[in-house]
């Protein structure tokens, strides 16, 4: 007997172990989040439909009524009975859709009442027979394997009326007769048979909740009787096929069992884990245990449902046990919604397909699994641009791949659900599940591929997932004069040196009278000494941290409001300037060069002197003049020691502050640009000749990718995001002296259409000349890559002018604050800057990620490695003049995302050692790497190299 070959052992199953496995997922093993790999050779790729959902023609050519035809008429508010995709009429269009996808199989169901209108096997309805013959022959002509479901919920209404449907045992034999006819008629062309699709839902919603046809509810006993009869009907058909048809047709037969997945509230709680097991067993186990397990209902059910659950005799247990040649599994929205579809037992429903596959493996002895239905749904208004469906599919498919490759689950095929939009049961036409969009109101019912169809086609074509964006890691080193830095935000100056020890000449005794006070000893005078930089406690601390970092450069920002409290030169805080000079000089003693930012606004605090803030801040053009005076002071006081200046940190993010209207945003940005340019010219003319430094402004420069690569508007949105975010400042400075044409035109067009009242300011000829070329290098703060889509927005705000919406790709490695780790975005950004604005020196002035770990910050280490790798590729392969990399940031701030190498109370994290290694190696040298910086080779042209020689 065929089922004796079965290799299933170990009953009862051990599915509950899934929840207690606790694999301690590493935050940086990207393969645990997303696996770039291929599926096994000859993996079975398919797509499915259900007859009732797509065939239409509900009373055409002699078809009989089904329970669902009746249910629509009596229970559902459906405006049209002919709203389906009409596959019965448009077979050729379905075949073209299948050709497009490149699938190896098509899973469809036969409509029992289309073949036998009253449900009994007499003479088959000729037109129905002709349709299925044509479908099968056409599939085989295309080398597409048919996977045929005998029963996908459309019971002939006559059998419901006459016998009460599946409550009646008579249906077991009637179903077997129908199956026999199908085996006889189609079996020569069909190698894979499914008897019943998701019997759980037939019983639960058809006879329990009444959500499905025939719409009966309230009779718990009926629910389990129906389940019992469905099991026996399946079993009978399997034995029939096994005995009478398998020997010559050599096919396989199973039943599709559907389920949800559930996670315990508390992973460590045995009680919660048992509840999860109970939840799974009462849905999937109800049918799986008899067939794939020991032949009986799960113990949980037999104990709990004693009065309503029919019992199997020993003979029946033997009869039903093993009646599946593979495990056909369905995982989709029908098992998740509505919420009363499953017993949650107070635990958390989850879409983790990998976990449920592992549960099946453990519970039922690692069977071969065909995923017979998987997918999600979109709202009915979504047409071909089903972006979220791509992410859902990507996630599901990758979970399957991980189950196969990492967990040894024996999945041999996958059915994407569904080929077409169609009738979605209790949702009728309010949701869509097709890979192809069908307009149900159109006469021709064209099948238009959605983005998800393009995506699925790509996955099938590649038999898995290729990491197209990334390139292999390189071995190699950065140039000798490369700046390895760390960035800190504003350094608040200490008003006085923290210790009076060397400025007060008196001697004190502590606690002489037991009052815990200092008492001056009269008549004794000590020698004092001048204040030293190291008297500043914060500087001492900083130097300690910087020395541990082993960096060559330290980027920090001055506090404008501290240096010039009144905003003009009438009151200069000399102590603050002395503090900053100390920071620089002490750093230089350790061979740590400064990169100084003059102005570092933050979301919470604009960092402007109070009088400037009160007179309008950056909305007042006179602030630019005040900034020039402040910058001039800093150049005079610190410029002999500082060779790299940043005027303004992330002026393109000031929109977060000046966001009352877009015109405020654009005006503030305009004034910032002019202020920067004035300062650049001041430095260029007055200070560069003697100080020989370089000056720029640093831009927040995240890369953007289309959320949906199959939709032109998303590509345009990605480019538009870059125009509004980076080109907004880069174009005037590095190219034309004016704002990007694309940005100007986009805003103007929205304003013309009444969608915005934004106006981008105009530069005068003098201002254009002033701004153009007013930066010596690119200073890029790059953290992540954003996935963007087009979404038209009304209103006069900078954010809405862009018509951009962000999406999170759930399959990507991301930080706690949801920053995606996508190193190749950095490479793309560097190339984009060079291609658009020319071959300038580049400094990555901030690059980092938040990591929750207080000590072993693995995510940060992984991030550092990968992003520095991209910088190295940009240098070695793209020949980009990358001069420095500044990791972000030195210390973290309390109650903010954790970006620091040191905690807010100065505790070191392990990423410091990792960064040390990168710095010491100057990159990623090979074992027998080329010449190092301290070796004479040719005529090196960098001062650092010459100093080292």
């Amino acid at each position: 007997d065929y089922k004796d070959d079965d290799d299933k052992l170990d009953f009862p199953g051990d599915g509950r172990a899934v929840w207690s496995q606790n694999p301690n997922l590493s935050p940086v093993n990207e393969s645990q989040l997303f696996l770039y790999d291929t599926f096994p050779k000859n993996f079975f790729w398919g797509v499915g439909t259900g007859a009732f959902q797509v065939e239409g023609s509900w009373k055409k050519d002699g078809k009989g009524l089904s329970v669902w035809d009746h249910f629509i008429a009596t229970h559902l508010n459906v405006s049209s009975r002919d709203g389906s995709s009409d596959s019965y009429i448009f077979l050729e269009k379905d075949l073209s859709a299948l050709d497009f996808l490149g699938v190896s199989f098509y899973q469809f169901s036969i409509s029992w009442p289309r073949l036998f209108p009253d449900g009994t096997v007499a003479v088959a309805n000729a037109k129905g027979l002709q349709y299925y013959n044509r479908l099968l022959d056409s599939l085989l002509l295309r080398n597409i394997e048919p996977v045929v479901t005998l029963y996908h919920w459309d019971l002939p209404w006559a059998l419901q009326e006459k016998y009460g449907g599946w409550k009646n045992e008579t249906l077991i034999d009637l179903f077997n007769d129908y199956a026999t006819y199908c085996f006889q008629t189609f079996g020569d062309r069909v190698k894979y048979w499914i008897t019943i699709h998701n019997p759980y839902l037939v019983a639960w919603h058809g006879y329990g909740t009444g959500l499905h046809a025939p719409g009966e509810k309230g009779n718990v006993a009926a629910v389990y009787t129906v389940g019992h009869n469905l099991l026996k009907a399946h079993s009978k058909v399997w034995h029939n096929y096994n005995r009478n048809f398998r020997p010559h047709q050599k096919g396989w037969l199973s039943i599709t069992l559907g389920s949800h997945w559930i996670e315990p509230n508390r992973a460590e709680s045995i009680v919660d884990i048992l509840k999860c097991q109970q939840s799974m067993v009462s849905v999937l186990g109800w049918f799986a245990n008899p067939i794939h397990g020991d032949g009986d209902y799960p113990e949980v059910m037999t104990k709990k449902l004693l009065s309503v659950l029919p019992a199997f005799s020993e003979a029946e247990k033997n009869e039903v046990r093993g009646t599946a040649d593979f495990f056909a599994f369905s995982f989709g929205p029908n098992n998740f919604k509505p919420l009363n579809t499953m017993a949650k037992m107070g635990q958390n429903v989850s879409l983790n397909l990998r976990q449920v596959l592992n549960w099946i493996k453990l519970e039922y002895g690692n069977p071969r699994i065909l995923i017979a239905e998987n997918g999600w749904f979109t709202d009915s208004y979504v047409q071909t641009e089903d972006t979220t469906a791509i992410y859902m599919m990507k996630n599901f498919l990758n979970q399957v791949l991980q189950a196969i490759r990492l967990d040894g689950v024996r999945v041999f095929g996958y059915t994407a659900w569904s080929l077409l939009d169609g009738f979605e049961w209790q949702d009728a036409y309010n949701t869509r599940r097709g890979l192809f969009y069908v307009d149900f109101n159109s006469e021709q019912r064209e099948r238009r591929p959605k983005s998800s169809a393009h995506y699925y086609k790509q996955v099938i074509g590649e038999n898995g997932f290729t990491l197209r964006e990334a390139t292999p890691d390189l071995q190699g080193q950065f140039p000798c004069d490369f700046s390895w830095g760390v960035t800190e935000s504003v350094l608040k100056p200490e008003s006085v040196a923290s210790s009076p020890q060397f400025s007060d000449p008196h001697l004190y005794v502590w606690n002489a009278t037991g009052n815990r006070m200092l008492h001056r000893v009269e008549g004794v005078r000590l020698k004092t000494r001048p204040a030293q930089c190291t008297d500043f406690i914060t500087i001492k601390k900083q130097l300690e941290m910087l020395a541990r970092m082993k960096v060559t450069h330290f980027r920090f920002a001055l506090d404008w409001a501290s240096v010039l409290p009144t905003g003009n030169l009438s009151e200069v805080n000399r102590q603050a300037l002395r503090y900053y000079r100390c920071v620089v000089t002490e750093g230089l003693k350790l061979n740590i060069s400064p990169m100084v930012t003059l102005y570092y606004p933050t979301h919470a605090h604009l960092g402007l002197p109070a009088p400037l803030l009160h007179s309008g801040g950056w909305l007042d053009p006179s602030t630019a003049k005040a900034f020039r005076d402040y910058a001039g002071l800093c150049f005079r006081e610190l410029g002999d020691l500082v060779k790299l200046w940043i005027t303004i940190n992330e002026p393109n993010r000031l929109s977060d502050v000046y966001n009352r209207t877009s015109n405020d945003t654009y005006q503030a940005a305009h004034n910032l640009l002019i202020a920067h340019a004035i300062v650049w010219h001041l430095y260029d003319r007055q200070y560069r000749p003697s100080q020989r430094g370089a000056l720029s402004l640093s831009l927040h420069s995240d890369w953007a990718e289309p959320a949906n690569p199959y939709v032109a508007s998303h590509w345009q949105a990605a480019e538009r995001f870059l125009q509004f975010e980076i080109a907004w400042f880069a174009e005037p400075l590095f190219k034309t002296g004016d704002y990007p044409v694309a940005m100007r035109e986009y805003i103007a067009s929205k304003t013309r259409r009444g969608l915005s009242s934004s106006v981008l300011p105009r530069f005068s000829d003098a201002e254009r000349r002033l701004v153009k070329g007013a930066a010596d290098f690119y200073a890029l703060n790059h953290f992540t890559t954003r996935f963007v889509m087009h979404e038209q927005q009304n209103g006069s705000r900078y954010d809405s002018d862009r018509d951009v919406q962000f999406l999170q790709d759930i399959t990507r490695l991301a930080s706690p604050s949801r920053l995606a780790v996508m190193p190749w975005g950095e490479g793309k950004l560097l190339r984009w800057m060079r291609n658009n604005y020319g071959d300038l020196d580049v400094y990555i002035t901030a690059n980092g990620i938040d990591d929750q770990a207080l000590q072993n910050d693995q995510l940060r280490q992984y991030y550092l490695e990968k992003y520095v790798q991209e910088a190295l590729k940009a240098y070695l392969i793209d020949k980009i003049k990358i001069k420095g990399y500044y990791a972000f940031k030195l210390t973290e701030e309390k109650s903010k995302p954790r970006f620091g190498f040191f905690t807010s109370d100065f505790k070191a994290k392990s990423s410091i050692q990792f960064y040390n290694k990168l710095i010491t190696s100057n990159g990623f040298p090979s074992e027998n790497g080329g010449p190092r910086c301290n070796q004479t080779q040719g005529n090196p042209e960098c001062t650092v190299c010459l100093l080292l020689l």
Epitope: T466, Q937, G938, P940
Partner: antibody, heavy 116, light 107 residues
Amino acid sequence: EVKFLESGGGLVQPGGSLRLSCAVSGIDFSRYWMSWVRQAPGKGLEWIGEISPDSSTINYTPSLKDKFVISRDNAKNTLYLQMSKVRSADTALYYCARPSPALDYWGQGTLVTVSA
Amino acid sequence: DIVMTQSPATLSVTPGDRVSLSCRASQSISDYVYWYQQKSHESPRLLIIYASQSISGIPSRFSGSGSGSDFTLSINSVEPEDVGVYYCQNGHNFPYTFGGGTKLEIK
């Protein structure tokens, strides 16, 4: 105007050595990577190697690594290719070019003939 | 080493024709492919970088496409002065190998 001018080619005996030079003008030589590419008579192009602006990184095609040395003198705006242990297969037109990253500026080439 | 295979080796065309020259890499090289034109007795000239980005000063009839391992250089409407040999180059992994070239000639 950007100019790359190769020199130093000529007839050389098998097993012998030769140093090719490439004088560069019209660009800030010290800021750019430089490459050598060769083309045997009637054949296609073969990438020889490249050198970084500060000479800290030099990449070669593996088969030529042991017989060719690329160097540069930024003070003289000159790129060099030192060839040793030459064979008849090394007969070719030798071009210097700037990779940024594709080879956007080329010299006219200098012909090296290896023959007894 | 990455092997770049160009096809066809020779292409005879009529002025005004649209032609496609193929280049296949032995492994995926993202979009790191550069195309050059070399006319008789001249140094090569750069046409396309990063598989599809055109170079200023190059006639707009030249365009590139592809990513991964299959790349195409297209000439929209061939002019007599387009005769010469066209090379693709891998710009992704050392050594930066060239294809064997496709010779374009006018019938």
